[in-house]
C-alpha cells in the first residue's frame, strides 16, 4: 500500500490515461494506411520471436547482479531501474513507476527452531534452526504434540481421524498454498504448522535444503486489507483476515525425518510419501515450535510501460511479471517471467515502430515486486487504481513461472478468455513434439481455478478484471521453487529446451496481446459464463427438497440465469447487426463485454472485508462455492448448517446474477423487468 | 459397534502350524496399530506381537520370535497370525487387540476380541 | 526385557473399601507408557488407565493411576461389586518386546 509522503522528485502514478503528455512511438517510414491483418500479425510475431535469445536473457537476471533480490532490496532496486531503462530504449508512449511503503515480514536476528521436548518441556534435542521461513507467521512459541496431516486440505484433515486441536501440524509442501494449509490448520484449532518436502513429491538430493514462502490468505500488504494506504485516507490500523494467528515453519526433509524418529503410525499408502513419513509423536515426547519472525516496513517500486492504443488508448491488457524472489533461488520463480516481459515488450516495441502494428487498445506491460509475499505489488496497484482501472483494463495476462517443464501446458483462466486460449493453443506448436497446444477438446474441464499465489487472482476475484496465466510444466512440481536450488543451471538441466519453451510461451501471450488489442471486437466469451451458471444451478437443484424445506424457491435464481443467458444471446446478435467500421457502436457493444467480470463482484460486501468479491472465483461466504459448501452443511451435520446465512447467500447470489444480466443487457431501457 | 472377531484357533500338534485370523469392523482398520495378546489357562496376560496400522513396522516377544509372523491385509480388515514351530507352552486363549488411540504403535489396547483357543498336543 | 512385579497377589476387601494396587518395574519406565487392565472371569481384558494416570474413555473416576519412574500404582476409591477382578499392569515403552506385571486379584473379604 501506498504512503504519499515522499520527496518531490516522487514519480506519479497511474498516468495512462494522460494522452496529451504522451509521444507517440517513433516509427519508421512505414504505410500507415494498410491495416495489418491476423495472419499477417501473427507470421510478424513469429519471426520476431525466432530471433530472440530468451535464455541469454534468463541467465543474465539470475546472475549474482541481480541476486538474491527480496521485495525492496537493493537488487531489486537496480533491476527495477534496469527494466525501466529497457522500457524508455523501447520508446515506449510512456514509462512510470509505482511506489509503495508495505510491511514484509522478515527473519530476526534471533533463530526460529524447532526442538523436541519431553513431556515436562525439557529439551530432547534441536531439530532444526531452518533457514527458511514463512512470512506472515505469528511470532509466538508453541509446544504440543506433533499430528501430520499429509498436505494440509480440508479433506486431509476430515480423513485424519484424530483431532488436531492443541496440537502441531506437520504438512507436506504441494498441492494448495501454505497460506491454505495453515489456515485448515487453524480453524482445527491446531497450534502451529511445520511445512517440509518429501522426496517422492520434490526429488532433491540435499534433504537440508530450506525453503520459503508466505502463509497470508490473501494478496497484498495484510495491514491494509482491501485499501491503499495513502496518508489522505487515514484509514485506522488494519490487519487483515487472512493473517494466521499460529506460527507456521518451513523445515528441511531432513529436520522432518529427524521428527519421524519421534514419532508413531504409518502414513497412509495412498498418500504416496516417503517411507519414513510417521503420522504422531510419541506420547513421551512434544515438539516446540519458535518463530520470532519481525515486520518491517519496506519501499517497493512496480515498473510501468505503455504503448498506447491507435483507437481506444483509454482501454487496456495489463502484461506482467514478478520481479523479486525471497531467498536466492530466482530463475523459475521470477527470471523466466521477467525476461519474457522485457523481450515482448521489445518485440511489440519493434513491431509499431518497424513493422507498422497498430494496436487499437493500449498494452501495459508491469514489473511487479513483492510477489513472494502474496503478490503484494500487483494488489496494491490495483487496490489504489481499482476506480481508474474499471471499464479501462480488461484483460491481466500473467507471465509468472510460464515454464517449469516442458509435458504439459495447463491454463488457469477466467472463463471469458477460454475461447480465446482454445484458439490459440490450436496455433501454437509445442516446440519438442512439433504438434498443437490443443491436445484435448475437453481441455477446459480441466483448468484450474487461479490460487491465492498467483498474481492473476487478485486482478480477477478483487478487480474484476478477466485474467489468464499458463505455464508448461510437468505433473509432479517443480521442486526447486522458494529455495536457493532455483538456479538457471537447475533450470536448464529440468528444461533442456528452455530457449525454445520460452518463445513458446512468448508466442502464447504475443498472440493473447494481440488478438484482444487489435480486433475490433472485444476477444472476450461473455456466453461462457452461461455454462458456468447453469453448473451452479444443476449443483443447487440436488438439494431442492432442502431448499423446499426451509420454505424456499429456486425459482428466481432461475429466472436470474435466464436473464444473463437472453443478454448475452441479445448482445450476439447485436455484435452480429453492429456495423465493424462504426467505432462508437462497437466501444459501446464492447464496454457491454468489459462489465461482464466485474459484475460477477458481489455489491454486497466490503472489499475491506472480503477484497475477493467474485462470486464464482472470490474467497468468503457470498460467494456461490461458499453456498454450496454451507447447503452441503445440511445434511451432513444439521448442528454446522447455518439457515440464516443460507437464506441472505441465496439472496445475494440470485441478486447478483440478475444484476450482471442486466448490466450485460445494455441501457436501463433494454432490461426486462418483468423478474 | 467396534467388533474384533478372532478365528483359526484349534487343536494342532507340536511342531505343526496355525494361521489365527481377526476380523475387525465398526472403525478405520488401517488407522490402528493392532496386537496379539495371549493367556495359558488360569495364568495371566503375555504380549506376543504388534504391528503397526501400515504393516510397515512389527515385533514379538522373545518367546515366538522367528516362529510366528503378524500381518495384516487393511483392504479386508483383517489382522493376522501366521504360528509355526508350535509348542506345548504355546498353548492359549488369543486375543487380538486394537491400540487405543489411531497411528500410535505404543499405546495401551482398547478394543479386545473375545479370544480364540489354541490347544496344542499330541 | 522389562519386569513387571505387582503386588499383593491377592486383594481382600469389601465394597466401599479403598484399593491401593501396585506395581513395580525392573527399570525406569517412562510414565507415558504404563497401563493398567482390569480381567473378569471368562471376559477378554478391558483399559481401565493408559499413560500412567489418563483414564479411558467410559472408565469411572473412581478408578485412577499415579506413579513414574519404577513406581506405579492403580487406586479404586471406592470399591464396586463390579470392581471384583483381576488387575494387570503394562509396560509398553521400552523397545519390545512388551510386558504385562503378574496381575493382582482383588477379591471379596
Known amino acids: 500500500c501506498k504512503r504519499v509522503e515522499q520527496k518531490e522528485e516522487c514519480v506519479k502514478l497511474a498516468e495512462t490515461e494522460e494522452t496529451d503528455k504522451s509521444e507517440t512511438m517513433e516509427t519508421e517510414d512505414v504505410p500507415t494506411s494498410s491495416r495489418l491483418y491476423w495472419a499477417d500479425l501473427k507470421t510478424l510475431l513469429s519471426e520476431k520471436l525466432n530471433s530472440i535469445e530468451f535464455a541469454d536473457t534468463i541467465k543474465q537476471l539470475s546472475q549474482n547482479t541481480y541476486t538474491p533480490r527480496e521485495a525492496g532490496s537493493q537488487k531489486d532496486e537496480s533491476l527495477a531501474y534496469y527494466i525501466e531503462n529497457q522500457f524508455h530504449e523501447f520508446k515506449f508512449s510512456k514509462v512510470w513507476r509505482d511506489e509503495h511503503y508495505v510491511k514484509i515480514q522478515v527473519k530476526d536476528s534471533a533463530q526460529n527452531s524447532v526442538i523436541i521436548v519431553d513431556k515436562n518441556g525439557r529439551l530432547v534435542y534441536l531439530v532444526e534452526n531452518p533457514g527458511g521461513y514463512v512470512a506472515y507467521s505469528k511470532a509466538a512459541t508453541v509446544t504440543g504434540k506433533l499430528v501430520h496431516a499429509n498436505f494440509g486440505t480440508k479433506k486431509d484433515f476430515e480423513d485424519l481421524y484424530t483431532p488436531v486441536n492443541g496440537s502441531i501440524v506437520i504438512v507436506r509442501a504441494g498441492k494448495i498454498t501454505f497460506a491454505e494449509k495453515v489456515a485448515n490448520a487453524e480453524s482445527l484449532n491446531a497450534i502451529g504448522v511445520l511445512i517440509y518436502m518429501d522426496q517422492t513429491k520434490f526429488p532433491i538430493v540435499n534433504a537440508e535444503l530450506s525453503f520459503f514462502g508466505h502463509a497470508h490468505l490473501g494478496t497484498g500488504d495484510p495491514y491494509t486489507p482491501g485499501f491503499p494506504s495513502f496518508n489522505h485516507t487515514q484509514f485506522p490500523p488494519s490487519r487483515s483476515s487472512g493473517l494466521p494467528n499460529i506460527p507456521v515453519q518451513t523445515i528441511s526433509r531432513a529436520a522432518a525425518e529427524k521428527l519421524f524418529g519421534n514419532m508413531e503410525g504409518d502414513c497412509p499408502s495412498d498418500w504416496k510419501t516417503d517411507s519414513t513419513c510417521r503420522m504422531v509423536t510419541s506420547e513421551s515426547k512434544n515438539v516446540k515450535l519458535t518463530v520470532s519472525n519481525v515486520l518491517k516496513e519496506r519501499r517497493i517500486l512496480n515498473i510501468f510501460g505503455v504503448i498506447k492504443g491507435y483507437e481506444e488508448p483509454d482501454r487496456y491488457v495489463v502484461v506482467g511479471a514478478q520481479r523479486d524472489a525471497l531467498g536466492a533461488g530466482v530463475a523459475a520463480k521470477s527470471s523466466v517471467g521477467t525476461g519474457l516481459l522485457l523481450k515482448l515488450a521489445q518485440v511489440f516495441s519493434d513491431m509499431i515502430s518497424k513493422d507498422g502494428f497498430r494496436p487499437s487498445r493500449s498494452i501495459i506491460f508491469a514489473s511487479w515486486t513483492a510477489g513472494d509475499f502474496g503478490a503484494v505489488g500487483a494488489t496494491e496497484w490495483l487496490e489504489g487504481y481499482l476506480s481508474s482501472l474499471h471499464l479501462k483494463a480488461f484483460t491481466y495476462i500473467n507471465l509468472d513461472k510460464v515454464v517449469l517443464g516442458t509435458s504439459n501446458f495447463k491454463v488457469s483462466a477466467s472463463p471469458l478468455l477460454y475461447t480465446l486460449m482454445g484458439k490459440i493453443m490450436q496455433d501454437v506448436k509445442h516446440p519438442v513434439d512439433g504438434k498443437s497446444l490443443y491436445r484435448d477438446s475437453n481441455w477446459i474441464s480441466k483448468v484450474e481455478k487461479l490460487s491465492f499465489d498467483n498474481a492473476a487472482y487478485p486482478f480477477l476475484a478483487y478487480s474484476g478484471i478477466p485474467a489468464v496465466s499458463f505455464c508448461f510444466c510437468e505433473d509432479a512440481d517443480y521442486p526447486y521453487l522458494g529455495t536457493r536450488l532455483d538456479t538457471y543451471e537447475a533450470l536448464t538441466q529440468k528444461v533442456p529446451q528452455l530457449n525454445q519453451m520460452v518463445r513458446t510461451a512468448a508466442e502464447v501471450a504475443g498472440q493473447l496481446i494481440i488478438k484482444l488489442t487489435h480486433d475490433v471486437e472485444l476477444n472476450l466469451d461473455y456466453e461462457r459464463y452461461n455454462s458456468q451458471l447453469l453448473s451452479f444451478v444443476r449443483d443447487l437443484n440436488q438439494y431442492r427438497a432442502d431448499i423446499k424445506e426451509m420454505g424456499l424457491s429456486l425459482q428466481w435464481l432461475y429466472s436470474a440465469r435466464g436473464d444473463f443467458f437472453r443478454a448475452t444471446s441479445r448482445l450476439t446478435t447485436d455484435f452480429g447487426n453492429a456495423e465493424k467500421t462504426d467505432r462508437f457502436v462497437m466501444k459501446k457493444l464492447n464496454d457491454r463485454v468489459m462489465r461482464v467480470e466485474y459484475h460477477f463482484l458481489s455489491p454486497y460486501v466490503s472489499p475491506k472485508e472480503s477484497p475477493f468479491r467474485h462470486v464464482f472465483w472470490g474467497s468468503g461466504s457470498h460467494t456461490l462455492p461458499a453456498l454450496l459448501e454451507n447447503l452441503k452443511l445440511r445434511k451432513q451435520n444439521n448442528g454446522a448448517f447455518n439457515e440464516t446465512l443460507f437464506r441472505n447467500q441465496l439472496a445475494l447470489a440470485t441478486w447478483t446474477i440478475q444484476g450482471a444480466a442486466n448490466a450485460l443487457s445494455g441501457d436501463v431501457w433494454d432490461i426486462d423487468n418483468e423478474f | 459397534e467396534v467388533q474384533l472377531v478372532e478365528t483359526g484357533g484349534g487343536l494342532v500338534q507340536p511342531g505343526g502350524s496355525l494361521r489365527l485370523s481377526c476380523a475387525a469392523s465398526?472403525?478405520?482398520?488401517?488407522?490402528?496399530?493392532m496386537n496379539w495378546v495371549r493367556q495359558a489357562p488360569g495364568k495371566g496376560l503375555e504380549w506376543v506381537s504388534v504391528?503397526?496400522?501400515?504393516?510397515?513396522?512389527?515385533d514379538y516377544a522373545d518367546s515366538v520370535k522367528g516362529r510366528f509372523t503378524v500381518s495384516r491385509d487393511n483392504s479386508k480388515n483383517t489382522l493376522y497370525l501366521q504360528m509355526n514351530s508350535l509348542r506345548a507352552e504355546d498353548m492359549a486363549t488369543y486375543y487380538c487387540?486394537?491400540?487405543?488411540?489411531?497411528?500410535?504403535?505404543?499405546?495401551?489396547?482398547?478394543?479386545w476380541g473375545q479370544g480364540t483357543m489354541v490347544t496344542v498336543s499330541s | 526385557e522389562i519386569v513387571l512385579t505387582q503386588s499383593p497377589g491377592t486383594l481382600s476387601l469389601s465394597p466401599g473399601e479403598r484399593a491401593t494396587l501396585s506395581c513395580r518395574a525392573s527399570?525406569?519406565?517412562?510414565?507415558?507408557?504404563l497401563a493398567w487392565y482390569q480381567q473378569k472371569p471368562g471376559q477378554a481384558p478391558r483399559l481401565l488407565i493408559y499413560?500412567?494416570?489418563s483414564r479411558a474413555t467410559g472408565i469411572p473416576d473412581r478408578f485412577s493411576g499415579s506413579g513414574s519412574g519404577t513406581d506405579f500404582t492403580l487406586t479404586i476409591s471406592r470399591l464396586e461389586p463390579e470392581d471384583f477382578a483381576v488387575y494387570y499392569c503394562?509396560?509398553?515403552?521400552?523397545?519390545?518386546?512388551?510386558?504385562f506385571g503378574q496381575g493382582t486379584k482383588v477379591e471379596i473379604k
Open positions: 504391528i503397526s496400522n501400515g504393516g510397515v513396522s512389527t
Open positions: 465398526g472403525f478405520s482398520f488401517d488407522k490402528y496399530t
Open positions: 503394562q509396560q509398553y515403552g521400552s523397545s519390545p518386546p512388551w510386558t
Open positions: 487387540a486394537r491400540a487405543s488411540q489411531p497411528w500410535l504403535y505404543r499405546t495401551g489396547a482398547d478394543v
Open positions: 527399570q525406569s519406565v517412562s510414565s507415558s507408557y
Open positions: 499413560g500412567a494416570s
